[in-house]
């Protein structure tokens, strides 16, 4: 039985040209996190394996930085970066947990962080 929950940074906004940290946190489970995949729609951005470190997809290597922790930093944001991002936690023995973050990249300087929220 999967008892864990993923807490994410929720709905966030950032300025064009700026950077943003995407972060998720798995709680309420003793399952071991073996790997976290970061994806945007159907594209793989990065993988963080607990022991083997990071893989950054070459199409994002100039604009994505590993961390902090299991999170991912997106840099040089463009309006095209607006959309859904997913953290996919591969755990043992529970299986897979997925968290969702919606990022809106704004032209103006009024971007503010949204509230955190949890999804089971």
């Amino acid at each position: 039985m999967m008892t864990g929950t993923i807490e994410t940074t929720g709905n966030i906004s950032a300025e064009k040209g700026g950077s943003i940290i995407l972060q998720c946190h798995l709680s309420s489970t003793t399952a071991q996190v073996t790997q976290v995949n970061w994806e945007q729609q159907d594209q793989l951005l990065a993988i963080c394996n607990a022991d083997l470190g990071w893989h950054i997809s070459p199409s994002f290597k100039d604009r994505v930085a590993p961390g902090p922790g299991l999170g991912l930093t997106l840099q040089s944001l463009t309006v095209n970066d607006t959309g859904e991002y997913f953290c996919i936690y591969h755990t043992y023995p529970d299986g897979t947990y997925t968290g969702r973050i919606f990022l809106e990249v704004l032209e103006s300087s009024v971007a503010e962080h949204g509230a955190r929220f949890q999804i089971p």
């Epitope: 790997q35 793989l44 022991d51 083997l52």
Partner: antibody
């Protein structure tokens, strides 16, 4: 230039253990994870696991869990793969291979070590 | 475990002709796929990574495409030195797995 030089061929009896070494040079050993891939004669490739030389952290293919142990000696930039409780179907070529930086692809490989398990 | 199924098992192509090798993953692996070339008595060599990126020094007659579950390696104009076995490889999730290989020969 980058080099991965493996130890020589071994002949072992069933139930024994074998330890294959992979001596590296030409790059920063602790900055790239090292993996082991094996290949039966005329057959395909099988990933056994990998080790982060900096932390000693390992990820194993569950198929070999409990039988394979990956270690490193940072002072000599050498990686080791030990396989225990050998069976006849472990008669294969074992390769060490390093990953690209920040990418899960093998860019350099050792020359391979043939381990023969025979009574 | 993710199963990578290659087809065909072997392929005979005339010099200068196109060779196409397919690889099907048992589940979606996005673009987390590489292609390796192995010649007899040698370790594999990286040709293509992230499904479509040619590795340094690899001739441009080699190209890769695909995402999700279906991937293709194409040799646009087969040369004698391309005779080898080709393997696809996924690293989307451990255990990392390889296809069974496709042997390419000259017709």
């Amino acid at each position: 230039q980058v080099q991965l030089v493996q130890s020589g061929a071994e002949v072992k009896k069933p139930g024994a253990s074998v330890k294959v070494s992979c001596k590296t040079s030409g790059y920063a050993f602790t900055e790239y994870t090292m993996h082991w891939v094996r290949q039966a004669p005329g057959q395909g490739l099988e990933w056994m696991g990998g080790i982060n030389p900096n932390t000693g952290g390992t990820t194993y293919n569950q198929k070999f869990q409990g039988r394979v142990t990956l270690t490193v000696d940072k002072s000599s930039s050498t990686a080791y793969m030990e396989l225990s409780r050998l069976r006849s179907d472990d008669t294969v070529v074992y390769y060490c291979a390093k990953l690209l930086r920040l990418m899960y692809y093998f860019d350099y490989w050792g020359q391979g070590t043939l381990v023969t398990v025979s009574s | 475990d993710i199963v990578m199924t290659q087809s065909p098992d072997s392929l005979a192509v005339s010099l200068g002709e196109r060779a196409t090798i397919n690889c099907k993953a048992s589940q979606d692996v996005r673009t987390a796929v590489a292609w390796y070339q192995q010649k007899p008595g040698q370790p594999p060599k990286l040709l293509i990574y992230s499904a479509s990126y040619r590795y340094t020094g690899v001739p441009d007659r080699f190209s890769g495409s695909g995402s999700g579950t279906d991937f293709t390696l194409t040799i646009s104009s087969l040369q004698a030195e391309d005779v080898a076995v080709y393997y696809c490889h996924q690293h989307y999730i451990t255990p990392w797995t390889f296809g069974g290989g496709t042997k390419v020969e000259i017709k």
